[in-house]
């Protein structure tokens, strides 16, 4: 079975490779902005979720992690860091999120909004292909 | 620098190893065989950094460490003495080791637990 490789390349040291993406799963806590800056310094971005089972490889993690979602007053919508809009199917509860807050997510598929100044763990993501 | 990986689809890569993240439960011996059938080995812990990473993403898993009895030392399936501390339970018959979010613990080899496999690149 080990011969059946995926077509994508592997990730930098201390990053997790899964389904052609690389993830940096922090063990230290930062504010949302500090987390965003750290991910950017790695030429990556805070986690942008494609679907709710994207993190099923770490489904046992107890922690909530900052992800790359913030409210745009200009667009009156929740946007990912690259400017794309949040799918309403990803977080059914997103209408209750306070626009001033930032979003933390756990690998069981739960999201919550918290003050962006709260220190949380965070996940950076790079797409390989 | 990036090197092209050699992990099967649906496995994860981390620091030059591939990991199979199991969802199914097996006894320790069954887990050993299940990993062998995937051309890999039951999860091993090489250092503190790897243990910190694994405990961040996994709830629990059998690891490749056991002992013949409570009077024997903990060894890996390769026969090497295991260096890390394994927290003992009160039960003498708990002779297989597992990784838990709070560290390494002894458990009953015949009980069914989640298992994960590892293959070094």
């Amino acid at each position: 079975e080990l011969q059946k490789d995926s077509d994508c390349c592997s990730c930098h040291e201390k990053w997790v490779g899964y389904r052609c993406n690389c993830y940096f799963i922090s063990s230290e806590e930062k504010t949302w902005n500090e987390s965003r800056h750290f991910c950017a310094s790695q030429k990556s971005s805070l986690l942008q979720l494609q679907n709710r089972d994207e993190l099923d490889f770490m489904s046992s993690s107890q922690h909530f992690y900052w992800i790359g979602l913030s409210y745009s007053e200009e667009h009156t919508a929740w946007l990912w860091e690259n400017g794309s809009a949040l799918s309403q199917y990803l977080f059914p509860s997103f209408e209750t999120f306070k626009p001033k807050n930032c979003i933390a997510y756990n690998s069981k598929g739960n999201a919550l909004d918290e003050s962006c100044e709260t220190k949380n763990r965070y996940i950076c993501k790079q797409q390989l292909i | 620098a990036r090197h092209c990986g050699h992990c099967p689809e649906e496995w994860i890569t981390y620091s030059n190893s591939c990991y199979y993240i199991g969802k199914e439960k097996r006894t320790w011996a069954e887990s050993l065989l299940a990993c062998t059938s995937k051309n890999s080995s039951l999860l091993s812990i090489d250092n503190e950094e790897e243990m910190k990473f694994l405990t961040a993403i996994l709830t629990s898993s059998w690891i490749d460490v056991f002992r013949d009895s409570s009077h024997h030392p903990w060894v890996t399936i390769n026969g090497l003495t295991f260096k890390h501390e394994i927290k003992e339970s009160d039960h003498a018959e708990h002779n297989c080791a597992m990784l838990h979010v709070r560290g390494l613990f002894s458990d009953e080899c015949g009980s069914s637990k989640i298992y994960h496999c590892k293959h070094k690149l």
């Epitope: 950017a40 790695q42 690259n82 | -």
Partner: antibody, heavy 121, light 113 residues
Framework: QLVESGGGLVQPGGSLRLACAAS????????MNWVRQAPGKGLEWVSV????????YCADSVKGRFTISRDNSKNTLHLQLNSLRAEDTAVYYC????????????????WGQGTLVTVSS | EIVMTQSPDSLAVSLGERATINCKSS????????????LAWYQQKPGQPPNLLIY???TRESGVPDRFSGSGSGTDFTLTISSLQAEDVAVYYC?????????FGGGTKVEIK
């Protein structure tokens, strides 16, 4: 804190070895840089080395002549300058990347005071 | 490599007045996946090493007075000193850290008029 040493007067074609002693942060966690400044001129990035020391990059102007290295056990960064030319005359600063892990896409949050290298016959 | 061009080369401003320095990159330093601009500003006083003022184009470094601000995106950036103080006399450099080799602008000397 970063403190450079090893500068001085050297003839064209000669060699020097600069050192930068680091303290106050976990040295091995950060990529480190050398930046130089010719008298009365602007800043020029010279070289970077990863935290582990296994990856380096150099500016084209010094490639093949300058070598960056580090000794994490001594918290020291080095720059070996060979085949020196008059245009290498400058103050050489070591500078710390702001963010840890395997990144070179950083601004510099700490700089040393610099050491002057003069290449003249 | 990305060439950074600063203007003006020098600038004389009265105390309390606004000073504006421009920096243009030969290619965009905006990364599309995170919409971050990989640009920093440094201040260098005579006989001293550079000192970080602004990073990610607009984030002020801790301890830097709020009269310093950075703006711009893509290829065009500005450092503004809203009310020039005597201690702001220095040379100011922009730097891109989007790609290696990392490159600096040629510097802008700010003086009191």
């Amino acid at each position: 804190q970063l403190v450079e040493s090893g500068g001085g007067l050297v003839q064209p074609g000669g060699s020097l070895r600069l050192a930068c002693a680091a303290s106050g942060f976990t040295f091995s966690n950060y990529a480190m840089n050398w930046v130089r400044q010719a008298p009365g001129k602007g800043l020029e990035w010279v070289s970077v080395i990863s935290g582990s020391g296994d990856t380096t990059y150099c500016a084209d102007s010094v490639k093949g002549r300058f070598t960056i290295s580090r000794d994490n056990s001594k918290n020291t960064l080095h720059l070996q300058l060979n085949s020196l030319r008059a245009e290498d005359t400058a103050v050489y600063y070591c500078a710390k990347n702001c963010y840890g892990s395997g990144s070179y896409y950083n601004h510099f949050d700490y700089w040393g005071q610099g050491t002057l290298v003069t290449v003249s016959s | 490599e990305i060439v950074m061009t600063q203007s003006p080369d020098s600038l004389a401003v009265s105390l309390g007045e606004r000073a504006t320095i421009n920096c243009k990159s030969s290619q965009s330093v905006l990364y599309s996946s995170n919409r971050m601009n990989y640009l920093a500003w440094y201040q260098q006083k005579p006989g001293q090493p550079p000192n970080l003022l602004i990073y990610w184009a607009s984030t002020r470094e801790s301890g830097v007075p709020d009269r310093f601000s950075g703006s711009g995106s893509g290829t065009d950036f500005t450092l503004t000193i809203s009310s020039l103080q005597a201690e702001d006399v220095a040379v100011y450099y922009c730097q891109q850290y989007y790609s290696i080799p990392l490159t600096f602008g040629g510097g802008t000397k700010v003086e009191i008029k």
